[in-house]
């Protein structure tokens, strides 16, 4: 058993039919010695007496919010939480595996630039009872500090007969060089409480690999005398890091109609415009990526043929 | 430490080419590097992050964009003190900060060339012969370093007598293209910029 | 399988002009762009031009403008190259080639020989 | 008009040996850049699109590096059957140039 946070106790198990649980001890935290009585929730049952409770924990039932009272009146309270343990491995029922990039990604991070600030988001199909709090930190061993705020939910999605909750969270380094040559990992962990359910994820990433630049701003398109061609110009995008000559970017620009499977003109460049040939019907888009370390592309920024 | 503004004309800017052959040098001895050794901890999630230069060069410091100097996280305390007179420092105006620079990004390449060098000898010495260091990145490194032409004490190569360890030699090779390729994109980030400039 | 099956081989006077075909088969043909390089005997290739089948658009190397023609045929999913003002340099193998994506190509045919000789 | 130069024009390789083909473009054309394979007789096929990207279909042997002005093909053990002469064509911009090829012959 170890403090989540103040009164808020998580209980280790390993849950398996038959399994013994855990012994725990509760200790009522006031100076009285006598008249003590104990009940858990909203229940009126005691459950035992005297300033310490030693209860066995074998499943949910058991977990929940133990008080000690005297006389009527409440002394304290303990919110016991259950982290399950299945065959060596702790349970991840609250989360939805994105699968993104692999197997097992519960937790996803995006930066738009080297500043040190990024953002990371999460799935879950549960609407009530939830709360998530998240700390973070470059490297483990000898943490440097990287703050955090609190968690939100930033979108709603229907996915066939589920409902889907994305949940997010912006943390900023506390001393970032954007130039700077990264060799620890940033650290993000993130409590997540269902009811009375306990479980942790984590996510080790350096920026530099989680960098996806925001779309190419301002794109305009300016036809070429006695051509089907076009010259497609656009602009760094404001949020990415300066100076622009040090932190260059390289962009593919792309002419395609509505569908994928359409015919389309490609070309990549390290400019900031280009020669493409438009077609009817079809759009200019433009995505960017940093150029000397290849991690995501941003979005399309694009603009119609016509 | 931070590079000034005024800087050759960029035209005159030999280096941007081969510090450009350098990144994509590594990137692709890197690559192979995973592929072959698909069964030794060769990812960047596996491996320990060691720079070899720690300490003995300054270069993210001694390169810094000006713009970045108003940055106090980037404004790290190292001192080190670089011989100053190079062939990609093309105009006369150029500032002790930038010979400072590059002689750093010189004294990097010749720390990395020295260990890919004992490395390689190391790997030929391998009877499995599983992998070898590409002759076209120690070729670019080279040439890097001629364009940057330092003057320079020259490091001896470590030679050993004790056995190679194979597996160890290949888990350090991994270690140091992975520092290495970051180091040279930091190298190209540098060339981009003084070429900007 | 997606196939492009050219014309046979032609001689041509100086000064005349040649008209190869290129049918293509598998896949609809509108849903790709269509060009034409040549090679000349023991030369490198040479791109021509291209056609856009579904609205006829074109646009050829400023070497070959006015003397070369790109048309194509949808109902019998065909392309043709016309040559025109022919002379002994002329003399290459002819080859139509295909993709979705307008600037490089997938599939090629076999290639055409035109031999220009009085 | 860009400017594709390939060399060198003839490669000696003995089969089971790596053999790479170097092309340079004439000014910086990004990864814009694809490789061809052409046997005597035959039509050229399509090995690599912008710079590395493998296309379905061919050996894993064959793969492509560069970007800017220097792009490299390699074949890391060269079977019988690669003995061919191998292009390279730009896309950056109009005309779309080829290199003159280089042919990689048995030693």
């Known amino acids: 058993i170890w403090e989540l946070k103040k009164d808020v106790y998580v209980v280790e198990l390993d849950w398996y039919p038959d399994a013994p649980g855990e012994m725990v001890v509760l200790t009522c935290d006031t100076p009285e010695e006598d008249g003590i009585t104990w009940t858990l929730d909203q229940s009126s049952e005691v459950l035992g007496s005297g300033k310490t409770l030693t209860i066995q924990v074998k499943e949910f039932g058991d977990a929940g919010q133990y008080t000690c009272h005297k006389g009527g009146e409440v002394l304290s309270h303990s919110l016991l939480l259950l982290h399950k343990k299945e065959d060596g491995i702790w349970s991840t029922d609250i989360l939805k595996d994105q699968k993104e990039p692999k197997n097992k990604t519960f937790l996803r991070c995006e930066a738009k630039n080297y500043s040190g600030r990024f953002t990371c988001w999460w799935l879950t199909t549960i609407s009530t009872d939830l709360t998530f709090s998240v700390k973070s930190s470059r490297g483990s061993s000898d943490p440097q500090g990287v703050t955090c705020g609190a968690a939100t939910l930033s979108a709603e999605r229907v996915r066939g007969d589920n409902k889907e909750y994305e949940y997010s969270v912006e943390c900023q380094e506390d001393s970032a060089c954007p130039a700077a040559e990264e060799s620890l990992p940033i650290e993000v962990m993130v409590d997540a409480v269902h009811k009375l359910k306990y479980e942790n994820y984590t996510s080790s990433f350096f920026i530099r690999d989680i960098i996806k630049p925001d779309p190419p701003k301002n794109l305009q398109l300016k036809p070429l005398k006695n051509s089907r061609q076009v010259e497609v110009s656009w602009e760094y995008p404001d949020t990415w890091s300066t100076p622009h000559s040090y932190f260059s970017l390289t962009f593919c620009v792309q002419v395609q109609g509505k569908s994928k499977r359409e015919k389309k003109d490609r070309v990549f460049t390290d400019k900031t415009s280009a020669t493409v040939i438009c077609r009817k019907n079809a759009s200019i888009s433009v995505r960017a990526q940093d150029r000397y370390y290849s991690s995501s592309w941003s979005e399309w920024a694009s603009v119609p043929c016509s | 430490r931070n590079l000034p503004v005024a800087t050759p004309d960029p035209g005159m800017f030999p280096c941007l080419h081969h510090s450009q052959n350098l990144l994509r040098a590594v990137s692709n001895m890197l690559q192979k590097a995973r592929q072959t050794l698909e069964f030794y901890p060769c990812t960047s999630e596996e491996i320990d992050h060691e720079d070899i230069t720690k300490d003995k060069t300054s270069t993210v410091e001694a390169c810094l964009p000006l713009e970045l100097t108003k940055n106090e996280s980037c404004l790290n305390s190292r001192e080190t003190s670089f011989i100053t007179n190079g062939s990609c420092l093309a105009s006369r105006k150029t500032s002790f900060m930038m010979a400072l620079c590059l002689s750093s990004i010189y004294e990097d390449l010749k720390m990395y060339q020295v260990e890919f060098k004992t490395m390689n000898a190391k790997l030929l010495m391998d009877p499995k012969r599983q992998i070898f260091l590409d002759q076209n990145m120690l070729a670019v490194i080279d040439e890097l370093m001629q364009a940057l032409n330092f003057n320079s004490e020259t490091v001896p190569q470590k030679s050993s007598l004790e056995e190679p360890d194979f597996y160890k030699t290949k888990i350090k090779l991994c270690i140091l293209l992975h520092a290495f390729r970051i180091r040279a994109v930091t190298i190209d980030r540098v060339m981009s910029y003084l070429n900007a400039s | 399988q997606v196939q492009l099956v050219q014309s046979g081989a032609e001689v041509k006077k100086p000064g005349s002009s040649v008209k190869v075909s290129c049918k293509a088969s598998?896949?609809?043909?509108?849903?790709?762009?269509l060009h034409w390089s040549r090679q000349a005997p023991g030369q490198g290739l040479e791109w021509m031009g291209w056609?856009?089948?579904?609205?006829?658009?074109?646009e050829y190397a400023p070497k070959f403008q006015g003397r070369v023609t790109i048309t194509a045929d949808e109902s019998t999913s065909t392309a043709y190259m016309e040559l025109s003002s022919l002379r002994s340099e002329d003399t290459a193998v002819y080859y139509c080639?295909?993709?979705?994506?307008?600037?490089?190509?997938?599939?090629w045919g076999q290639g055409t020989l035109v031999t220009v000789s009085s | 008009d860009i400017v594709m130069t390939q060399s060198p024009l003839s490669l000696p390789v003995t089969p089971g040996e790596p053999a790479s083909i170097s092309c340079r473009a004439s000014?910086?054309?990004?990864?814009?850049l694809h490789w061809y394979q052409q046997k005597p007789g035959q039509a050229p096929r399509q090995l690599i699109a912008?710079?590395?990207q493998s296309i379905s279909g061919v050996p894993s042997r064959f793969s492509g590096s560069g970007s800017g002005t220097d792009f490299t093909l390699t074949i890391s053990s060269l079977q019988p059957e690669d003995f061919a002469t191998y292009m390279c064509?730009?896309?950056?911009?109009?005309?779309?140039?080829f290199g003159q090829g280089t042919k990689v012959e048995i030693k």
């Open positions: 912008f710079a590395s």
């Open positions: 064509q730009q896309s950056n911009s109009f005309p779309l140039t």
């Open positions: 080639a295909r993709n979705k994506e307008l600037r490089y190509f997938d599939v």
């Open positions: 056609i856009d089948p579904e609205n006829g658009d074109t």
């Open positions: 598998g896949g609809t043909f509108s849903d790709y762009y």
């Open positions: 000014q910086s054309i990004s990864i814009n």
